[in-house]
């Protein structure tokens, strides 16, 4: 019996005979060594990183890794062009800006190029595997006398993100959080003068553009209360 | 251990429809890819469809909008349903599984496959 694997255009291309003989009538025939499995992150759309562990081969292998994108302009097979290397051993590939298509099925093709027979071939929707870069230039106004607005920006399409802010005082032992939507600004309706209070967010490429499940870093953090300075009350920048 | 069983198949005429179940004993299915396979007498096996266990779902281009794949992790179970049926969709249907640590492995290749089920004939009449 031989394996397929699936070309740009959608068909199959016979490869090799890959799995023992009683393959599949034996419900439970196992394949031979597999390949480590790849995963990809888009990081804010700049470029992303398709690693895999490396460390897992039962000898030092130089995997290679090609990719297209099924049913699309792009369905030309492409090797890595920029690989990256743990331990002088590949171990993943960088693709740039222009080489990434979020909305078109990324199929991604590992190989033994010492045993060629030897492949995977994974699909991903690379809208799911965007992380965006943490939120920056947190500010805080006061509002009144009791309510504070925290706002921030992002280095990417503000509607195509969600957020996550946590915030506490020095008095409380854990963060409470709050979601908010792609408006990137938080109020917080009733503040207590005499507490210093921290403030961080985190950001997610959900739900609007995609069902990314990962958060970005937490942002630097940003503090409104009594240990800060009194010169400008309505108006607090970020401290580092 | 993995085991799998499918079935579902059946004869049918052209247009009509079929649901093919593959369920698993011996272990959840909550961390393993799962992918549908095909293989027509005197024809290699082709891939179907296949998924992710964090629920992303991929389609060969020969069944893309007529046949879904879905998964009910409550009941280990995995399934394929055939809408708007065609001869030459005629083969063994085979199910199979891989473990994977990513939520986002998908595998349209057989050989990444560690375990396979017996095959469900699925014969459609002109």
């Known amino acids: 019996l031989n394996t397929t694997i699936l070309t740009p255009n959608g068909n199959e291309d016979t490869t090799a005979d890959f799995f023992l003989t009683t393959m599949p009538t034996d419900s439970l025939s196992v394949s031979t060594l597999p390949l480590p499995e790849v995963q990809c992150f888009v990081f804010n759309v700049e470029y992303m990183n398709c690693t895999w562990n490396s460390s897992s081969e039962p000898q030092p292998t130089n995997l290679t890794l090609h990719y297209w994108y099924k049913n699309s302009d792009n369905d030309k097979v492409q090797k890595c062009s920029h690989y990256l290397f743990s331990e002088e051993i590949t171990s993943g590939c960088q693709l740039q800006k222009k080489e990434i298509h979020l909305y078109q099925t990324f199929v991604v093709q590992l190989q033994d190029p010492r045993e060629p027979r030897r492949q995977a071939t994974q699909m991903l929707k690379l809208q799911n595997l965007v992380i965006p870069w943490a939120p920056e230039n947190l500010t805080l106004h006061k509002l009144s006398e009791s309510q504070l607005e925290l706002n921030w920006n992002n280095r990417f399409l503000n509607h195509c993100l969600e957020h996550l802010v946590q915030y506490r005082t020095d008095w409380d032992h854990s963060w409470t959080e709050q979601s908010v939507d792609y408006r990137h600004k938080f109020s917080l309706p009733s503040v207590d003068g005499q507490k210093r209070y921290t403030f961080r967010v985190r950001s997610r490429f959900n739900p609007l553009c995609g069902s990314a499940q990962h958060w970005s870093e937490w942002s630097h953090p940003i503090h409104w209360g009594s240990n800060t300075s009194k010169e400008n009350p309505f108006l607090f920048a970020l401290e580092a | 251990q993995v085991q799998l069983v499918e079935s579902g198949g059946g004869l049918v005429q052209a247009g009509g429809s079929l649901r093919l179940f593959c369920a698993t004993s011996g272990r959840t299915l909550s961390r393993y890819a799962m992918g549908w396979f095909r293989q027509a007498p005197g024809r290699e096996r082709e891939f179907v469809a296949c998924?992710?266990?964090?629920?992303?779902?991929f389609y060969a281009d020969s069944v893309k909008g007529r046949f879904t794949f879905s998964r009910d992790s409550a009941k280990n179970t995995v399934y394929l349903q055939m809408n708007s049926l065609q001869p030459e969709d005629t083969a063994v249907y085979y199910c199979?599984?891989?473990?994977?640590?990513?939520?986002?492995?998908?595998?349209?290749?057989?050989?990444?496959?560690?375990?396979w089920g017996q095959g469900t004939q699925v014969t459609v009449s002109s």
């Open positions: 199979a599984a891989a473990p994977t640590s990513f939520a986002t492995t998908a595998y349209s290749s057989s050989n990444s496959y560690a375990y």
């Open positions: 998924d992710s266990w964090g629920g992303d779902t």
